[in-house]
Each structure stands twice: as C-alpha cells, then as structure tokens.
Amino acid sequence: FKVATPYSLYVCPEGQNVTLTCRLLGPVDKGHDVTFYKTWYRSSRGEVQTCSERRPIRNLTFQDLHLHHGGHQAANTSHDLAQRHGLESASDHHGNFSITMRNLTLLDSGLYCCLVVEIRHHHSEHRVHGAMELQVQTGKDAPSNCVVYPSSSQDSENITAA
C-alpha cells in the first residue's frame, strides 16, 4: 500500500480550523491478523529523509494522536486529551485519514507528517508516511479561508477548503 497526500500545502488565516488529510492507497489486507497504526506528528524541512524526525503537535506526541484498527475501519482519537488541545485525528472506511486543528495560530505553521504502519502478527511490516506544509498567515495578505494546493503537478489550480 501507499500513502497519498491530496494536498501538499495548506494556507490558512489565523483563528481558522483546518483538516490535514492523507489517504491509504492500494490493496489493504483485511485479515484478522492485520491492523494499521496511524498517527500524525510535526517534522522539519532540510533533512536527509522527510518525516524522520517526530516532533509533537501542540505538545501532543505521535503516541497521543495515534489510531489503531483493522483494515478500512473507522476510528477517532481519544477525545479528551486531543480536544483540550484543539486537535482530533480520524480515519474513515475509505482509507482517508485526517487531523483537524482548531483555532490556528502562527505557531502551528510547519511541516506535518502522517504515518501508517501495517502490523501483522505483532510485527511492523510496512511503514509509509506523507508530508504536507501548513502556513498560517495573519494581516491583510492572509486569505479569508484556508486555501489548499494539490500535490499533483498536473492540478495547478488552487482548491479552497470548505
């Protein structure tokens, strides 16, 4: 399987909410012995390997934000801790996997990574990640809503997030 990031860049005004998204692509084994660990974390540019460094999102580590479930099952993070920090990660039946960040501030700007680990018989068979950038802007140059930029070079038009 692979992880796709529909959007490589999210540009949002301060105070707005944003949902960063990754998508699980390819055949997903639904055997009872196969589960998926999914999580989010911040990283930094300029590394040899993007997403190798795992830094917290609003003081929550990738361990705090993880989901663990079988195949394309739906799941949500434990609400209390994450929601206190204005965060919620979720996964649906179609392989979409997201983190919602509420009331954005300039400090939220940076590189975000999603990580998916396929676990079979308590062995981590595959680890794949996706990366995307969040820019939080303030002042007259800031957009009124979040603007997202597709990862694919063919899609040159901006898509405004609902």
């Epitope: 055997g31 009872h32 361990q63 062995h123």
Partner: antibody
Framework: QVQLVQSGAEVKKPGASVKVSCKAS????????MHWVRQAPGQGLEWMGA????????SYNQKFKGRVTMTRDTSTSTVYMELSSLRSEDTAVYYC?????????????WGRGTLVTVSS | DIVMTQTPLSLSVTPGQPASISCRAS??????????VHWYLQKPGQPPQLLIY???NLESGVPDRFSGSGSGTDFTLKISRVEAEDVGVYYC?????????FGQGTKLEIK
Amino acid sequence: QVQLVQSGAEVKKPGASVKVSCKASGYTFTDYWMHWVRQAPGQGLEWMGAIETSLNYPSYNQKFKGRVTMTRDTSTSTVYMELSSLRSEDTAVYYCARWGIYGNPWFAYWGRGTLVTVSS
Amino acid sequence: DIVMTQTPLSLSVTPGQPASISCRASESVDSYVNSFVHWYLQKPGQPPQLLIYRASNLESGVPDRFSGSGSGTDFTLKISRVEAEDVGVYYCQQSNEDPYTFGQGTKLEIK
C-alpha cells in the same frame, strides 16, 4: 547474534509493583516488537503482551490490561515490563522474547528469565 | 481466546523408541496456506527453545528426529527415536490470533 539479557530476581510484597528489564543486542532494536511471556512455578507459559519498539506502542493481553505497562528506551535498546498490584499468583519467571527473522510469528529468541516472587 | 489442549500431559519413553504428542486448538489456527502452530522444548532451568515452526518446519540446529504435522485444529509433534537429551516439557503455541496461547505442556521422561 541476538541476545536478550534480563534483570535479576526480585522479591516483592503483595500490592507492590515490579519492573523487569530486557536489554537487546545483536540486531536493530527498533525493527522488532518485544514480547513478554510468564511462567508460574510448575505451570505453563502465558503471553502478557508486546511493545512496538520504534513507536513505543504496547499491545497487552486483555487479562493484564490495567496492571501491566510496557515501555522501551531506544538509547539503551532496553524494554521494560512493569506489573502493579502484585498478588501471590504473580509469582513467576518472566521472559522477554522476540519473533524470528523478518517478524515471523514464533518465539525464536528468549531471555533467560527473571524470577519475581510475591510474598508477604 | 484460542485454547490449546495437549495430550498426553506426561510421557515415559525408552531411549530409541518413538514418541508422539498431540495438540488440539479450540478453533482453526490456519491463515491462508499457513498453520500458525509452533512447538517448543523447555529443559529444566532454561527458557523454551523453538523446535518446529508453522506446524511442520524444523528450526535450524534442531535434530531431524523431530517432526511436526497437522493443520486446522489438530497438530502432532513426533520424535522418531527418543534420546536422553530430549527430556523436558514440550509446548505447542498458536500465533494466529492475539492473545497468543500455549498448550499446558507435556513432560517427557526417559524410562
């Protein structure tokens, strides 16, 4: 070669906690989960759970949930298993164990075991 | 949880004679083409050592007098000619489903 070296024997009182360590060498520590299996005197083997050493993500046997905590320290390639609210039935040898190469799901490597005695 | 039931619980065998231990799972432990049942020998004062993996595969370094067979719910460990060094407790184990479970053990003694 793969080696799993465990901490020494412990004697604990009922209600107390015990923390057993398992230091791994001879392979890339974060490539494999580490499992814990216990064996009461003269009894069989019981799987307690395992920890994903890269993610620090534990998976416990339901029977021990709430009493067992598995953690790891990647800087020393060491895994820890802490069992709380000890009772006499927890007197056992506690083994750390690792799956075979490529994560094949059978216990190819074992520590020598740590005897934990719970007695008032 | 899958219950693994071994028979017999003890066995006394003359050196050079064969021995057989049975292990029955409470539900199938097959996944695709594999049977996730394994056999271990535990000698006194030692941790268990792997003998057979995936029902019938001999672990490296284990004498070929040991063999395993079976699928689904019924599995057998055979020793073609028992030797003095084979004494100990034999365990079957399933890893098809969490929690992983072991049989209660079969103690092999030499007559």
